[in-house]
C-alpha cells in the first residue's frame, strides 16, 4: 500500500515532498515565533522588531567604498560570487527521505496561489503548519516562555547608512551606522500596516490550540539576541540547500505555492545572520562590530 512504503526513487511527482516542506517551514516559523512571538501570535511590536532586525524597517543608504590600495582592479565585486555551495549538514538536513520527481510544473496558473504561508504562515497562531496549518498558527516551541519586550529605539525617520569596506583578503565587511535624519521619510510608520494574519489574534481562537512542553528548557532569547555565537549556529543555506531541505528538487522551476514554503526559512536565515561571519575584533584592519558577508547564493 503506497502509504506505508517509500521507494528510493522519487516519491512526489511534482518534485516537492510536501510533508517535508510543511515540517521544515514549521521549524523555521517556530524559530521566528520563539524569538518574536508571544502567545502564539506576532504582535505589531514583535513584527516591527523582526523587520528591524532583518534590516527592512527603514530606508537605508548604502555607500560602497573602493579601496584601491587593496583592490586596484575593482575585483572585489566578484568576491560575492565566490562562496558557492557550502555543504552543510545541520540537524535540519533531511535528505534521506525526500526524493524528488519530475515536476508537473503546475506552474501556478495566473493567480499562482500565493499561499499566505509565508508571512501569513504561522503568524496567526495556531494552525499553521504550513500556512497555518501548515497553516496559519504561530507555533512556538514548547520552551518558549515570556518574551522580553524591547522598546523600539529607532524611529521611522532615521536612516541607516551601510558602508562596505573592502579588506585585503577580498572579504567585504558590512558596517551599519545609525544616522538620525530630520524630516519624514514615510507617509506613515512602516510597521503600522502589517499583514492581516499578523495582527488578527481572533484567528488564534478558531485555530488549533497549542500546549507547551515544559520539559524542554531553553532560555528564550530577547529580540536582540546575540546571533551565531558558538551555541548552535544556524547554517547559511544557499539556494540548493534551501530547496533540498524543504524536499524540493533543484532542477525545476518554483511556482508561487512552492516558494511560499521557503519564506520562513529565508526570513529566519536573514534574521539569524546565518550568512554573516561575526569577525573577531582582533584583526587590526577590521573595525569593531562588523560583519563579514558570506554570500552563499
Amino acid at each position: 500500500f503506497p502509504q506505508t512504503t517509500e521507494k528510493i526513487s522519487p516519491n512526489w511527482e511534482s518534485g516537492i515532498n510536501v510533508d517535508l516542506a510543511i515540517s521544515t517551514r514549521q521549524y523555521h516559523l517556530q524559530q521566528l515565533f520563539y524569538r518574536y512571538g508571544e502567545n502564539n501570535s506576532l504582535s505589531v511590536e514583535g513584527f516591527r522588531k523582526l523587520l528591524q532586525n532583518i534590516g527592512i524597517d527603514k530606508i537605508k543608504r548604502i555607500h560602497i567604498h573602493h579601496d584601491h590600495d587593496h583592490h586596484s582592479d575593482h575585483e572585489h565585486h566578484s568576491d560575492h560570487e565566490r562562496h558557492s555551495d557550502h555543504e552543510h549538514h545541520s540537524e535540519h538536513e533531511h535528505h534521506s527521505d525526500h526524493d524528488h520527481h519530475s515536476h508537473h510544473n503546475h506552474a501556478a496558473s495566473g493567480k499562482n496561489k500565493r499561499k499566505a504561508l509565508c508571512p501569513d504562515h504561522d503568524s496567526d497562531s495556531s494552525g499553521k503548519d504550513p500556512r497555518n496549518s501548515q497553516g496559519k498558527g504561530a507555533h512556538r516551541p514548547e520552551h518558549a516562555s515570556g518574551r522580553r519586550n524591547v522598546k523600539d529605539s529607532v524611529s521611522a525617520s532615521e536612516v541607516t547608512s551601510t558602508v562596505y569596506n573592502t579588506v585585503s583578503e577580498g572579504t567585504h565587511f558590512l558596517e551599519t551606522i545609525e544616522t538620525p535624519r530630520p524630516g519624514k521619510l514615510f507617509p506613515k510608520d512602516v510597521s503600522s500596516s502589517t499583514p492581516p494574519s499578523v495582527t488578527s489574534k481572533s484567528r488564534v481562537s478558531r485555530l488549533a490550540g497549542r500546549k507547551t512542553n515544559e520539559s524542554v528548557s531553553e532560555p528564550r532569547k530577547g529580540f536582540m539576541y546575540s546571533r551565531n555565537t558558538n551555541e548552535n549556529p544556524q547554517e547559511c543555506f544557499n539556494a540548493s540547500k534551501l530547496l533540498t531541505s524543504h524536499g524540493m528538487g533543484i532542477q525545476v522551476p518554483l511556482n508561487a505555492t512552492e516558494f511560499n514554503y521557503l519564506c520562513p526559512a529565508i526570513i529566519n536565515q536573514i534574521d539569524a545572520r546565518s550568512c554573516l561571519i561575526h569577525t573577531s575584533e582582533k584583526k587590526a584592519e577590521i573595525p569593531p562590530k562588523t560583519y563579514s558577508l558570506q554570500i552563499a547564493w
Partner: antibody, heavy 113, light 107 residues
C-alpha cells in the same frame, strides 16, 4: 521504507484515559511532523493534532483540554494520550506523516462500559 | 474551523465513464487541499496534494483542480479498482479538516 505502526487500541471504559503509540521507521522524527487523525462512522475523519520536529504541538481546539501528544525521538515513537473518554470517541485512530500517503494502518478504540 | 463540503454524497458511475467529485471550503484555503481514496478496511491513500499535484504511483486518470474555495477531483475513465470513498482535506488552517466523503459506486 517508510512505515508508521499504531498500537494500544482496544476497549476503554468511559471516563478513563487512552494511550496510543505510533512507531515510525524509514525516516526521522526530527525531520517530519506527525499528525493524529481519527475516523468514526458518525463524524468521519477528524484531525486531532500534530507534534512537530522540535517537539511543539498543535491541537484541534475541540480536544485541547484532554489531549497530549509527545514523542521520543531516540525510539522513533510518538505517544497519544486522550483523557475522559466518552462513547463518541470510539473510532479508528491513525498517525500520519502530514498530508501525504504515509499513514499507519490505524488502531481501533472502542469506548464502552 | 473551515468546513469542507463534498458533493455528491454518492456517485453511481459505470466503468470507463468519467467521474467528477466536488469539494467546497467554507473559506479560502488557497491550494492547500489533498484528495484521498479509501477502500474498506484500509487507511486513506493520498492521490492529489496542493489541489492539483499527483503523488507518484497514482494513475494519470486522476487529476485535481481548483483553488480558493472550490476543488474538483476528476477520474477520467473509471476502473474497477477506483470504486471507493474519496475525501478532500484542507491543510491551510488549523484544525485541518476533511470533507464527509463521496462514495463512488458501480452503476
Amino acid at each position: 521504507q517508510v512505515q508508521l505502526v499504531e498500537s494500544g487500541g482496544g476497549v476503554v471504559q468511559p471516563g478513563r484515559s487512552l494511550r496510543l503509540s505510533c512507531t515510525v521507521s524509514g525516516f526521522s522524527l526530527t525531520t517530519y511532523g506527525i499528525h493524529w487523525v481519527r475516523q468514526s462512522p458518525g463524524k468521519g475523519l477528524e484531525w486531532l493534532g500534530v507534534i512537530w520536529t522540535g517537539g511543539t504541538t498543535d491541537y484541534n481546539a475541540a480536544f485541547i483540554s484532554r489531549l497530549t501528544i509527545s514523542k521520543d525521538n531516540s525510539k522513533s515513537t510518538l505517544y497519544f494520550q486522550m483523557n475522559s473518554l466518552r462513547a463518541e470517541d470510539t473510532a479508528v485512530y491513525y498517525c500520519a506523516r502530514g498530508p501525504s500517503s504515509y499513514w499507519g494502518q490505524g488502531t481501533l478504540v472502542t469506548v464502552s462500559s | 474551523e473551515i468546513v469542507m463540503t463534498q458533493s455528491p454524497a454518492t456517485l453511481s458511475v459505470s466503468p470507463g465513464e468519467r467521474a467528477t467529485l466536488s469539494c467546497k471550503a467554507s473559506q479560502n484555503v488557497d491550494t492547500n487541499v489533498v484528495w484521498y481514496q479509501q477502500k474498506p478496511g484500509q487507511s486513506p491513500r493520498a492521490l492529489i496534494y496542493s489541489a492539483s499535484y499527483r503523488y507518484s504511483g497514482v494513475p494519470a486518470r486522476f487529476s485535481g483542480s481548483g483553488s480558493g474555495t472550490e476543488f474538483t477531483l476528476t477520474i477520467s475513465s473509471l476502473q474497477s479498482e477506483d470504486f471507493a470513498v474519496y475525501f478532500c482535506q484542507q491543510y491551510n488552517n488549523y484544525p485541518w479538516t476533511f470533507g464527509q466523503g463521496t462514495k463512488v459506486e458501480i452503476k
